[in-house]
Amino acid sequence: PEPPTACREKQYLINSQCCSLCQPGQKLVSDCTEFTETECLPCGESEFLDTWNRETHCHQHKYCDPNLGLRVQQKGTSETDTICTCEEGWHCTSEACESCVLHRSCSPGFGVKQIATGVSDTICEPCPVGFFSNVSSAFEKCHPWTSCETKDLVVQQAGTNKTDVVCGPQDRLRA
């Protein structure tokens, strides 16, 4: 019979012959022959192959380097790579998430518009008139100035974007 020029899915062509690919989690030890099947071996500890393949070496699981702020989100198997994520309080530098950076805090005078996630930094916004923030924080929004009137008090010191108003008693000695 004519030797094949193409093989079925999950097969590969070698020496004019269709051999079975190794299943995910296994690597190729030897190609099939006219008389023998493809020989495959399971990947070792901390190794994986995630496709039907003819690879002679398994890939090493990704190392989630703690010095880069990374931790294991999902442990790898013989068929899947390890998934790294950033430690809490840190976020990925890029989409590839090969390193992390500490979430930024919003300085006094600024409040948190959007809290940081594992893939995005804190977004800060200036406190508008009537609001203040007197702390550096990755969580605190701008707080509204205290309403002196509702406490039957008067403003003794105006508020700023960094300080609350200071309330005081009303002057009873009006002429």
Partner: antibody
Framework: EVQLQQSGPELVKPGASVKMSCKAS????????MYWVKQKPGQGLEWIGY????????NYNEKFKGKATLTSDKSSSTAYMELSSLTSEDSAVYYC???????WGQGTSVTVSS | DIVMTQAAPSVPVTPGESVSISCRSS???????????LYWFLQRPGQSPQILIY???NLASGVPDRFSGSGSGTAFTLRISRVEAEDVGVYYC?????????FGSGTKLEIK
């Protein structure tokens, strides 16, 4: 091999600006922020801030806001720091360091003198 | 800002002996998720700083195991056993739990 190659020494006049560079090689430039650190002669280290080459995000030490501007260029894998309105207080060696603080440039010496 | 204090400006040591360098922070460096963010660096004369220890006690790649770090909260120690001539330089601690990151003033290791 990871390397950070910084530009050469600068002698500048008070009031002028200076822009120094830090060229990265041996790793994916956009995967790490680049920190900048100041060291005055015979003194300790001071953190200036960082630039994230992936999205051009920056974060500055309040003390250096208005003094330092951090940028980067993905195409050349280079981070930059510009210092403005220079005074004698800005005379120092400036280092760039990769985001894990595991690799540092050799430093750029800036001398401000009339 | 967090203030990092290295009380001893210098420590003299005889080669082959052990030495400890201390560092204190004005605020705990323990993050709410449980990790403590303190680096140790060595700056040899005329060179750039190099990382020795990260997260208090983890040895950085390529650093001899004569170096070790310990401590928690606000008090930290770098220990060098069997000091060698090449260990001379200034040792800095640095916190990176909160912006701006801050360094200690440095401790100079001198050979007797």
């Amino acid at each position: 091999e990871v390397q950070l190659q910084q530009s050469g020494p600068e002698l500048v006049k008070p009031g002028a600006s200076v822009k120094m560079s830090c060229k990265a090689s041996g790793y994916t430039f956009t995967s790490y922020v680049m920190y900048w650190v100041k060291q005055k002669p015979g003194q300790g280290l001071e953190w200036i801030g960082y630039v994230n080459p992936y999205n051009d995000g920056t974060n500055y030490n309040e003390k250096f806001k208005g003094k330092a501007t951090l940028t980067s260029d993905k195409s050349s894998s280079t981070a930059y720091m510009e210092l403005s309105s220079l005074t004698s207080e800005d005379s120092a060696v400036y280092y760039c360091a990769r985001g894990a603080m595991d690799y540092w440039g050799q430093g750029t010496s800036v001398t401000v003198s009339s | 800002d967090i203030v990092m204090t290295q009380a001893a400006p210098s420590v003299p040591v005889t080669p082959g002996e052990s030495v400890s360098i201390s560092c204190r922070s004005s605020k705990s460096l323990l993050h709410s998720q449980g990790n403590t963010y303190l680096y140790w660096f060595l700056q040899r004369p005329g060179q750039s700083p190099q990382i020795l220890i990260y997260r208090v006690s983890n040895l950085a790649s390529g650093v001899p195991d004569r170096f070790s770090g310990s401590g928690s909260g606000t008090a930290f120690t770098l220990r060098i056993s069997r000091v060698e001539a090449e260990d001379v330089g200034v040792y800095y601690c640095m916190q990176h739990v909160e912006y701006p990151f801050t360094f200690g003033s440095g401790t100079k290791l001198e050979i007797k």
